[in-house]
């Protein structure tokens, strides 16, 4: 299947929040565009 | 509207030192990678480096690697390209662009700014 | 380093006339990128991985290719397709651009 970014970044907001409040943890951001080049990319859109 | 303003262009001496910026707007800068490719007067466009959206990935070809160094403000929206030990051969426009490419794809180097001339000479 | 030689490097044609442009890679890539340079002009990009038209870019242009040797069609030239051209490959660094071909006006 297919993974939607946005969902994957509600979820981690949530998890994020229950991280601080259970166990007083605090996760800055996690970033989903920092990715190496794509140097084995083929051709097509 | 997606705009590229690059300066710190000029007139430097061999040997000598200079950083370019560019200021980008209109897109979420983190979520690109952004390059730097020059053009010398006349001649074919070379690529100079290339940085990821958040700064892990850092790419420049052997003409440049050990004196330019790229480096990105995500929290200003401005990219950097720190040049150092300069020579004659670096004289030419600098061209900040934006990267379109992702984990498993390449889209090009989809917006250019309208470059800043550097130009190295005693 | 992987070298892209791009024929002819001037091309004189007519508005209305096809353009047809090559450019050749001293070892084989996945995908090439074309660009557009007007005299005094940034670059921009016109067809991206091999076959893509860019946002903006009309039909006319068109791409095709694959291994070492790539072509860049213009169907129809209007007045403001009289450019420089490259190609680029990213399939390997360092990234490299072609030599160019210039399509001026008869």
């Known amino acids: 299947g297919t993974i939607n970014v946005h969902d994957v970044e509600t979820q981690f907001n949530q998890y994020k929040t229950e991280a601080a409040s259970r166990y007083n943890l605090t996760i800055s951001d996690v970033s989903v565009s920092d990715v190496p080049f794509p140097f084995s990319a083929q051709s097509g859109a | 509207e997606v705009q590229l303003v690059e300066s710190g262009g000029g007139l430097v001496k061999p040997g000598g030192s200079l950083r370019l910026s560019c200021a980008a707007s209109g897109f979420t800068f983190s979520r690109y990678g952004m390059s730097w490719v020059r053009q010398a007067p006349g001649k074919r466009l070379e690529w100079v480096s290339t940085i990821s959206g958040g700064g892990t990935y850092i790419y420049y070809p052997d003409s440049v690697k050990g004196r330019f160094t790229i480096s990105r403000d995500n929290a200003k929206n401005t990219l950097y390209l720190q040049m150092n030990s300069l020579r004659a051969e670096d004289t030419a426009v600098y061209y900040c662009?934006?990267?379109?490419?992702?984990?498993?794809?390449?889209?090009?180097?989809?917006?250019w700014g309208q470059g800043t001339l550097v130009t190295v000479s005693s | 380093e992987i070298v892209l030689t791009q024929s002819p490097a001037t091309l004189s044609l007519s508005p209305g006339e096809r353009a047809t442009l090559t450019c050749s890679a001293t070892s084989s890539v996945s995908y090439i990128h074309w660009y557009q340079q007007r005299p005094g002009q940034s670059p921009r990009l016109l067809i991206y991985?091999?076959?893509n038209l860019a946002s903006g870019i009309p039909a006319r242009f068109s791409g095709s290719g694959s291994g070492s040797d790539y072509t860049l069609t213009i169907s129809s030239l209007e007045p403001e397709d009289f450019a420089v051209y490259y190609c680029q490959q990213r399939s390997s660094s360092p990234f490299t651009f072609g030599s160019g071909t210039k399509v001026e006006i008869k």
């Open positions: 662009t934006r990267d379109n490419y992702g984990r498993n794809y390449d889209y090009g180097m989809d917006y």
């Open positions: 991985s091999t076959s």
